[in-house]
């Protein structure tokens, strides 16, 4: 399916414009901001989603920035350049000609420079650690039940094969989901761990990207699992290149 045929919508991306102008009158959906045609049977790439988000009418919400010392995305939202496949271009620049290199999930991995900055290749993020803190519950969740439910969720909702969920760690109230996917492991059609992590992050923040489906209702053996904070750490196949100044 390219989209839901009956009412011509995109189940996996509500930030699209859809019309029955595809081949044979099929429903075709294009991402807001970029106009790129998307496959609505799978997750849309994070780059196209971020571009669509930046093109959407701004609301009054202010951005909360993560701790600057954490190995997380400290730069927040920006309007990215995406390649024809919807991946982040290795080099990103803003309107003031400040440029930087990003990894495959769009997180800056070098110091900022000018237009002369070169980013030779898009470095793949092959290991993602999703760090969650859940709201207090009557008792701790059973670890194996939690592991099973999260793997099921990533498979069924985000279409990520469980082989890319390397581990689920639990020490109440902290849950850590390790996603791993080497370039050699990722076959055509496999969802990228970066895209799955982004959809999950938006879901737990109550900002679901899915069209028409209810928000995320996470339950472990019937007990609601409510997330009160999320941190995501990214590990690239090639270490990032920051100057020592940034590390002090």
């Amino acid at each position: 399916h390219t989209a839901a045929q009956d009412n011509c919508t995109c189940p996996t991306n509500k930030m699209t414009v859809c019309s029955p102008d595809g081949p044979g009158g099929r429903c075709q959906c294009r991402a807001l901001g970029s106009g790129v045609a998307v496959d609505c049977s799978t997750l849309t790439s994070e780059c196209l989603l971020l571009k669509a988000r930046m093109s959407a009418p701004k609301n009054a919400r202010t951005l909360v920035r993560p701790n600057e010392h954490a190995l997380v995305d400290n730069d927040g939202l920006y309007d990215p350049d995406c390649d024809p496949e919807g991946r982040f271009k290795a080099r990103q620049c803003n309107q003031t000609s400040v440029c930087w290199c990003v990894n495959s999930v769009g997180v800056r991995r070098t110091d900022k420079g000018d237009l002369s900055l070169r980013c030779d290749e898009l470095v793949r993020t092959h290991h993602i650690l999703i760090d969650l803190r859940h709201r207090p519950t009557a008792g701790a969740f059973n670890h194996s039940d939690l592991d099973a439910e999260l793997r099921r969720l990533f498979r069924e909702r985000y279409r990520l094969h469980p082989k890319f969920v390397a581990a689920v760690h639990y020490e109440q109230p902290t849950i850590q989901i390790e996603l791993r996917q080497n370039t050699s492991q990722k076959a055509a059609g496999d969802v990228d761990i970066g895209d799955a992590a982004y959809y999950f992050e938006r879901d737990v923040k109550g900002e679901s990207l899915f069209q028409g489906r209810g928000g995320l209702d996470l339950r472990v053996r019937g007990e609601p699992l409510q997330v009160e904070r999320t941190l995501i750490y990214y590990l690239d196949e090639i270490p990032p290149k920051f100057s020592m100044k940034r590390l002090t």
Partner: antibody, heavy 119, light 111 residues
Framework: QVQLVQSGAEVKKPGSSVKVSCKAS????????INWVRQAPGQGLEWMGV????????SYNQKFKGRVTITADESTSTAYMELSSLRSEDTAVYYC????????????WGQGTLVTVSS | DIQMTQSPSSLSASVGDRVTITCRVS??????????MHWYQQKPGKAPKLLIY???NLESGVPSRFSGSGSGTDFTFTISSLQPEDIATYYC?????????FGGGTKLEIK
């Protein structure tokens, strides 16, 4: 309790099609994908394909591509497997099986539907 | 496709015996320590029943005499003390990549 109940046995002519149903109960239908597996008489098990009950789309074993169509109806919690251009080698018991929680194991199975292809 | 070689294809054992079945896979089904290998029991005229998932995890409600081990490409299924009700055909299966494939089966009989 989780149950997968399949439609009854069928006798079909070569060249025709058959559609087998699998009604799920005891859990939220869209939470688990459903697989189809077949077993020819006295033979082993062969995976045919899987449908995402959440998205409604299927992926198939290339061996059956073009001949098999797996669908699902969320309103009745029922999955269907249709096999076309039947030949005698398609005589088999067809099973639906639900994915388990974490590792794509098949944790619950239907009772099976015998499809006999004979002229 | 991932090929599964299961052996023996049939075996005869006495009640109380320790029974071992092996399954060799054409390529590794291990992903970061998680082995996508499962074992099923099928009795005549019945649907298969999941016994072991992820190479060594016992499915809920399955007797503890059944166990599984192995990683990568070589896996073993064991019945520690054969019971009369264990007469069945046993299959290994990989779910690492599709098409998911099954071993040829091991038919277990009582001596």
């Amino acid at each position: 309790q989780v149950q997968l109940v399949q439609s009854g046995a069928e006798v079909k002519k070569p060249g025709s099609s058959v559609k087998v149903s699998c009604k799920a109960s005891g859990y939220t239908f869209t939470d688990y994908s459903i697989n189809w597996v077949r077993q020819a008489p006295g033979q082993g098990l062969e995976w045919m394909g899987v449908i995402s009950t959440y998205y409604g789309d299927a992926s198939y074993n290339q061996k059956f591509k073009g001949r098999v169509t797996i669908t699902a109806d969320e309103s009745t919690s029922t999955a269907y497997m249709e096999l076309s251009s039947l030949r005698s080698e398609d005589t088999a018991v067809y099973y639906c099986a639900r994915y388990g929680d974490g590792y794509n194991q098949f944790d619950y199975w239907g009772q099976g539907t015998l499809v006999t292809v004979s002229s | 496709d991932i090929q599964m070689t299961q052996s023996p294809s049939s075996l005869s054992a006495s009640v109380g015996d320790r029974v071992t079945i092996t399954c060799r896979v054409s390529e590794s089904v291990d992903s970061y320590g998680n082995n996508f290998m499962h074992w099923y029991q099928q009795k005549p005229g019945k649907a298969p029943k999941l016994l072991i998932y992820r190479a060594s995890n016992l499915e809920s409600g399955v007797p503890s005499r059944f166990s599984g081990s192995g990683s990568g490409t070589d896996f073993t299924f064991t019945i520690s003390s054969l019971q009369p009700e264990d007469i069945a055909t046993y299959y290994c299966q990989q779910s690492y990549e599709d098409p998911y494939t099954f071993g040829g089966g091991t038919k277990l009989e009582i001596k």
